[in-house]
Every structure is written in structure tokens, then in C-alpha cells.
């Protein structure tokens, strides 16, 4: 699971340390890359590769860093305007409607289909029916069921492009 | 089932202002950043402010920044979107919406983003 530690978890020490720049907020409102003092005067510049914040805002904190899990790859660091970006590795992915954690792609399609799309890292292989071409639900099939694209090997690795 | 029902929008002229009000059936509510996004005729959706969990700090879009404001009652689990100086470019219908994740810490994306209402309309023109 990505680090569920939030700034408030810190000391207040820890969150604003005496060397960070400072400036003026805007109506209010601190640039993306800073957060706002706590007497609303000063906007402090985030700590590259520890905390963010990626738009306008009047947080008394930066937001921390999120840590790709295991089986995860980043793909980007966090900077002060933008946190992580982590990808599923090769031959698992994490779809939108389950966010929480990378799941192993279907090695094949069952009996009766054929495979028309690749494993990626947002999908998992896509099956079809043969004859009518409509899509299979999803279900993991029985092992003696699954077709292979050949003997023991992955129908198809993942792709981290893209 | 979470439901999101906002509320508010209507026609109005350009520095006028609007409240709108999005109330959540969900009990998760009081503990997740909610967002206010907006989608203007033809343009995709495009993120306007998120809120923290506990009401205290908050993301703008810098096309709204100072002049629309964000808050949220966790106790009557509303959130709410004061527009004020509106712009002929504020026309769209705004959604308010819930992250995918309940341990997002502010989310600003649309992707990020699972459980949306219905949205409601808000024109300005002279």
C-alpha cells in the first residue's frame, strides 16, 4: 500500500524547515509548489522529493510524496508541483475500477476466443468470442481452459510505453 | 450506493455570483477530499477544487483562483462552491465528485475520481 503518513503526522519542525523560500500569496491562495504559513502571510516552497502541491491552494502543509508499492515501477520522481507517477510492472496492470493494487494479466484467452488486445499496465489482455466478436466478461478461466499463444509462455508480456 | 446531488446553478449575469450545494449520501463523505469539476459545451471536463477530508485547505484551478471558494460541512455532508465575479468562460455544468480511493489525500484529476452527480447548469450571459 502507498505510505497512508500524512504532513499532519509530523512535527511541526519536520513540515517547514528554516531555509525554505517564501513569497507572498495571492488573493489568499499560495502557488502550486508552496503552501501557506499558518498566519496566512507567507507561501513556503515545498521540499523536492518530499512533499507537493500541484495547484493554487491555502494548505498549511505540502502533501507527502507517495512511495510506489512493490510491484510497482516509477515512472516519473516527485517534484514540488507534482507528486510520483507509478506503473504497474510488466505483465500486471490496476484498472480504474480498482485502483488499490496491480493485478497478475490473464496468461490467454479461454477456449472458443481469441486475443485482441495486450496486456498493459491499465488492462489486462482483451478476449473475444471466434464467431460473434463480442467481449469476454472477464472471469479467470479454469487452467485446462486457457489457450496459450504457445506452450508455457505468456500470450503477451506488458508494455511499460505508453 | 453513493449518491451525489448538487444543486444551485441557474442563469446569471457576468460579476454576479452563485452558490452551489452538493449533499452526499454516503457516511465516507466526512472522510475523503471531495472536488467540484465543471464541463463547459463541447470541452472536456476539467478540474475547478478539491477540498481535504477535514475542510481545511483546498486546491484551485488558476482560472478561478480568488474569486470561486470551496468549503464543506461534514456534518450535513454538503459540499459547497461559492462563485463569485462570474465569466462568460464559467459557463458549463459543474459535477462535485468523490476520489476512487478513500485514502486520497487531494486528489485533481478526473481520473481520480469515481462517484459523480448528475451536475448542474450554470450560465452567464448579459
Known amino acids: 500500500e502507498s505510505a497512508l503518513i500524512t504532513q499532519q503526522d509530523l512535527a511541526p519542525q519536520q513540515r517547514a524547515a528554516p531555509q525554505q523560500k517564501r513569497s507572498s500569496p495571492s488573493e489568499g491562495l499560495c502557488p502550486p509548489g508552496h503552501h501557506i504559513s499558518e498566519d496566512g502571510r507567507d507561501c513556503i516552497s515545498c521540499k523536492y522529493g518530499q512533499d507537493y502541491s500541484t495547484h493554487w491552494n491555502d494548505l498549511l502543509f505540502c502533501l507527502r510524496c507517495t512511495r510506489c508499492d512493490s510491484g510497482e515501477v516509477e515512472l516519473s520522481p516527485c517534484t514540488t508541483t507534482r507528486n510520483t507517477v507509478c506503473q504497474c510492472e510488466e505483465g500486471t496492470f490496476r484498472e480504474e475500477d480498482s485502483p488499490e493494487m496491480c493485478r497478475k494479466c490473464r496468461t490467454g484467452c479461454p477456449r472458443g476466443m481469441v486475443k485482441v488486445g495486450d496486456c498493459t499496465p491499465w488492462s489486462d489482455i482483451e478476449c473475444v468470442h471466434k464467431e460473434s466478436g463480442t467481449k469476454h466478461s472477464g472471469e479467470v478461466p479454469a487452467v485446462e481452459e486457457t489457450v496459450t499463444s504457445s506452450p508455457g509462455t505468456p500470450a503477451s508480456p506488458c508494455s511499460l510505453s505508453g | 450506493e453513493v449518491q451525489l446531488l448538487e444543486s444551485g446553478g441557474g442563469e446569471v449575469q457576468p460579476g454576479g455570483s452563485l452558490r452551489l450545494s452538493c449533499a452526499a449520501s454516503?457516511?465516507?463523505?466526512?472522510?475523503?477530499?471531495v472536488g467540484w469539476f465543471r464541463q463547459a459545451p463541447g470541452k472536456e471536463r476539467e478540474f475547478v477544487s478539491a477540498i481535504r477530508w477535514e475542510g481545511v485547505g483546498a486546491y484551485y484551478a488558476e482560472s478561478v483562483k480568488g474569486r470561486f471558494t470551496i468549503s464543506k460541512d461534514n456534518a450535513k455532508r454538503t459540499l459547497y462552491l461559492q462563485m463569485s465575479s462570474l465569466r462568460a468562460e464559467d459557463t458549463a455544468v459543474y459535477y462535485c465528485?468523490?476520489?476512487?480511493?478513500?485514502?486520497?489525500?487531494?486528489?485533481?484529476?478526473?481520473?481520480?475520481?469515481?462517484?459523480w452527480g448528475q451536475g448542474t447548469l450554470v450560465t452567464v450571459k448579459p
Open positions: 454516503v457516511s465516507t463523505f466526512g472522510t475523503s477530499p
Open positions: 465528485a468523490l476520489p476512487r480511493r478513500g485514502d486520497a489525500e487531494l486528489p485533481s484529476t478526473v481520473k481520480e475520481y469515481g462517484y
